[in-house]
Interface confidence: low
């Protein structure tokens, strides 16, 4: 089903406008900002969500060490250009003709340049490391229970195939979730790890993108898992290209 037929809403994306103007009077939903039709049975792409967000009113040890090539989204929000499939265009520019190249999750991977900057291809982010610190609890969570619950969450709330959740690491109070998805592994219909990570990030921040569903109430054996800090690292199939000046 494309959207909820009864009251014509999009269960997986509240930043949409829906109306029964699809084939046969079916409910059809379009993303705010771009006006693109979205499939409400799965997650909406991060690019369309960012675009919708920018169009909305403004008030509205065993642990993994990130690789030297890991990117953190330091640039924050911007109004992205999305392709007809809703993916980020490889080159992004702002209103002052400053341009840069991004990866498949929309994070800048080159120095900023002018309109002559070339971005030959959209480089895929194939490894995402979600680094969480949870609030103090009476004791540490059981690792295997935590592992099972987080895998379950990604499968069921975000519809991400379990094979893409590579590992869950835990050293109280730090939790790390590793998502891995190579270009060759991603089949048609598979949720993209970048989209799943973005929905998760928004859920953790109490800004759920789901329509009408309550906020994320994550529990491990009944014990609430409350996150107080989130860091997300992105690793691309091709390392980013920054000048030495930035690296120092």
């Amino acid at each position: 089903h494309t959207a909820a037929q009864d009251n014509c809403t999009c269960p997986t994306n509240k930043m949409t406008v829906c109306s029964p103007d699809g084939p046969g009077g079916r409910c059809q939903c379009r993303a705010l900002g771009s006006g693109m039709a979205v499939d409400c049975s799965t997650l909406t792409s991060k690019c369309l969500l960012l675009k919708a967000r920018m169009s909305a009113p403004k008030n509205a040890r065993t642990l993994v060490r990130p690789s030297e090539h890991a990117l953190v989204d330091n640039d924050g929000l911007y109004d992205p250009d999305c392709d007809p499939e809703g993916r980020f265009k490889a080159r992004q520019c702002n209103q002052t003709s400053v341009c840069w190249c991004v990866n498949s999750v929309g994070v800048r991977r080159t120095d900023k340049g002018d309109l002559s900057l070339r971005c030959d291809e959209l480089v895929r982010t194939h490894h995402i490391l979600i680094d969480l610190r949870h609030r103090p609890t009476a004791g540490a969570f059981n690792h295997s229970d935590l592992d099972a619950e987080l895998r379950r969450l990604f499968r069921e709330r975000y519809r991400l195939h379990p094979k893409f959740v590579a590992a869950v690491h835990y050293e109280q109070p730090t939790i790390q979730i590793e998502l891995r998805q190579n270009t060759s592994q991603k089949a048609a219909g598979d949720v993209d790890i970048g989209d799943a990570a973005y929905y998760f990030e928004r859920d953790i921040k109490g800004e759920s993108l789901f329509q009408g569903r309550g906020g994320l109430d994550l529990r491990v054996r009944g014990e609430p898992l409350q996150v107080e800090r989130t860091l997300i690292y992105y690793l691309d199939e091709i390392p980013p290209k920054f000048s030495m000046k930035r690296l120092t």
Epitope: A148, R152, R155, E156, R159, P162, F210, R213
Partner: antibody, heavy 123, light 107 residues
């Protein structure tokens, strides 16, 4: 090919204990949830217990508090211990493999079954 | 435990398409998951025909398919054959329960 071989069934006495073992082969045992499903004579299927790849466990209501599921990844075996046996525990017990690893809540995910081992609880 | 609802019996002529529905599974984070298990005779080992709503084990013919709409899952057998005559049980992810079974008779 995936094969699951159960052993340990037979005639048991009420109040006694039962230990069933399932040996898996033809797949990476450590990567998948495993469990037990039983079928009483003339009845439907009933979830008994399961254990995830991370060793998280789950139990059916009828055996909770009496059952323990465990696994030996090195031996590729999963074991079901059922104590305080009752006549209603009489059933064929099937070992079942999940198509996934990360959860012991798995009844919709079973992709392979053993041939079953018959357990009769009678005095 | 939640009770899964499926029809007690369905029948079809060879070559016809048959649908068996299953509903009543518990939702988890707003989604539902079902599996379908074929048993040729009571006491014989079940065989998985569909798991995780739509996935088909490699040894199962493509005439078996699964689909979900809301909280209901449907097992569809396209071009039913005499060999498909069996009891079909559905199973639900969150509740970890099975339906009572649907007997498929091929006329």
């Amino acid at each position: 090919a995936v094969t699951l071989d159960e052993s340990g069934g037979g005639l048991q006495t009420p109040g006694g204990a039962l230990s069933l073992v399932c040996k898996g082969s033809g797949f990476t045992f450590s990567s998948y949830a495993m469990g037990w499903v039983r079928q009483a004579p003339g009845k439907g299927l009933e979830y008994v217990a399961a254990i995830s790849s991370g060793s998280s466990t789950g139990y059916g209501a009828a055996v909770k508090g009496r059952a323990t599921i465990s696994k030996d990844t090195g031996q590729s075996t999963v074991r079901l211990q059922l104590n305080n046996l009752r006549a209603e525990d009489t059933a064929t017990y099937y070992c079942a493999k999940s198509g996934y690893g990360g959860s012991a809540s798995y009844v919709s995910d079973i992709d392979a079954w053993g041939h079953g081992t018959e357990v009769i609880v009678s005095s | 435990a939640l009770a899964l609802t499926q029809p007690s019996s369905v029948s079809a002529n060879p070559g016809e398409t048959v649908e068996i529905t299953c509903s009543g599974g518990g939702d988890y984070y707003g989604t539902y998951y079902y599996g379908w298990y074929q048993q040729k005779a009571p006491g014989s080992a079940p065989v998985t025909v569909i798991y995780d709503n739509t996935k088909r084990p490699s040894n199962i013919p493509s005439r078996f398919s699964g689909s979900t709409s809301g909280s209901t899952n449907t097992l569809t057998i396209t071009g039913v054959q005499a060999d498909d005559e069996a009891i079909y049980f559905c199973g639900s992810y969150k509740s970890n329960t099975f339906g009572a079974g649907t007997t498929l008779t091929v006329l």
